[in-house]
């Protein structure tokens, strides 16, 4: 009797279990009692990444340079193109459909993790003993100058935005 369920990589149509098309190929015609499923390879600009019964392949993603995108990995008949962002930019989402400039860490904050094509700059507040006096996408918090090692004394305390000010020791005492 005609099947009601089919094996893996098959589909049921007109009471027949037909083979799915392999990744990289699209369905041309369903199988019959007497013939196999017929599949055709996707064209150069298209792909299908699963066993399927699609009659059309999907277009490869376009990495639009006007949106700051560039090709990270060229698509094949079985995989989509992977886009990434140009230098100084990162993706706005996981699917990387557009790019925005990396943010800079404001004074008082340092770079914890430098941005990549797919992730933004991660900033952290400068802890006690460290400072950042610039707005930068690269600079970490720097340690306060150690006056003692220079045989100097602290004349003005440091903050998260400023270094300590060292001065000579008072020799009159």
């Amino acid at each position: 009797e005609p099947p009601t369920a089919c094996r893996e990589k098959q589909y049921l149509i007109n009471s027949q279990c037909c083979s799915l098309c392999q990744p990289g190929q699209k369905l041309v015609s369903d199988c019959t009692e007497f013939t196999e499923t017929e599949c055709l390879p996707c064209s150069e600009s298209e792909f299908l990444d699963t066993w399927n019964r699609e009659t059309r392949c999907h277009q490869h993603k376009y990495c639009d340079p006007n949106l700051g995108l560039q090709v990270q990995q060229k698509g094949t008949s079985e995989t989509d193109t992977i886009c990434t962002c140009e230098e100084g930019l990162h993706c706005t989402s996981e699917s990387c459909e557009s790019c925005v400039p990396h943010r800079s860490c404001l004074p008082g904050f340092g770079v914890k993790q430098i941005a990549t094509g797919v992730s933004d700059t991660i900033c952290e507040p400068c802890p006690v003993g460290f400072f950042s006096n610039v707005s930068s996408a690269f600079e970490k918090c720097r340690p306060w100058t150690s006056c003692e090692t220079k045989d100097l004394v602290v004349q003005q305390a440091g903050t998260n935005k400023t270094d300590v000010v060292c001065g000579p020791q008072d020799r009159q005492r």
Partner: antibody
């Protein structure tokens, strides 16, 4: 219900071309399946002659030595058989078939 | 071409008794996907062949369940569990895995 019906002359002279048409109802010949011609000489078994596919491409039995052509008229949902340079050995009942559904057959006699 | 050999060429069976027909191919009928395209037909006297079994073991719609097909590779069998008077005729196997499609020479079933 899929139905197939053969039509054409019942008598053909030797060396001439046998021409038959199969009219299909209940299914489009461009949708799927292979549309076949099969013949049966008197008192003998069945011989596959060839097919035309849903997409218009063909396959023929090499034993017929390039004498056979199968074509189609999609506007009439028909496919046709031409067999050239016939001899008495081509006398047979000719069937058109989708392999699950068959026509009732038409007898063609080759004689002068 | 794939040669299909049927045995026996004729058999006489008492109504209600079983019958079995063998069909052997000269090469495997299993394709690269693991599917085997082997059909069984019955041609009753004066009629077109009618499909009984396709893909070795699948009964065509409306075919009584006393008909069953089995086999793989090069060795196939059609069984009739209890023969009835209406089962008389010539049984053919047909392979459609390889082009050209080829029929067995036929097995004539008659009632005792």
């Amino acid at each position: 219900e899929v139905q197939l019906q053969e039509s054409g002359p019942g008598l053909v002279k030797p060396s001439e071309t046998l021409s038959l048409t199969c009219t299909v109802s209940g299914y489009s010949i461009t949708s799927n399946y292979y549309w076949n011609w099969i013949r049966q000489p008197p008192g003998k078994g069945l011989e596959w002659m060839g097919y035309i596919r849903y997409d218009g491409s063909n396959n023929y039995n090499p034993s017929l030595k390039n004498r056979v052509t199968i074509s189609r008229d999609t506007s009439k949902n028909q496919f046709s058989l031409k067999l050239s340079s016939v001899t008495a050995a081509d006398t047979a009942v000719y069937y058109c078939a989708r392999l699950d559904y068959w026509g009732q057959g038409t007898t063609v006699t080759v004689s002068s | 071409d794939v040669v299909m050999t049927q045995t026996p060429l004729s058999l006489s069976v008492t109504p209600g008794q079983p019958a079995s027909i063998s069909c052997r191919s000269s090469q495997s009928l299993e394709n690269t996907n693991g599917n085997t395209f082997l059909n069984w037909y019955l041609q009753k006297p004066g009629q077109s062949p009618q499909l009984l079994i396709y893909r070795v073991s699948n009964r065509f719609s409306g075919v009584p369940d006393r008909f069953s097909g089995s086999g793989s590779g090069t060795d196939f069998t059609l069984k009739i569990s209890r023969v009835e008077a209406e089962d008389v005729g010539v049984y053919y196997c047909l392979q459609v895995t390889h082009v050209p499609f080829t029929f067995g020479q036929g097995t004539k079933l008659e009632i005792k």
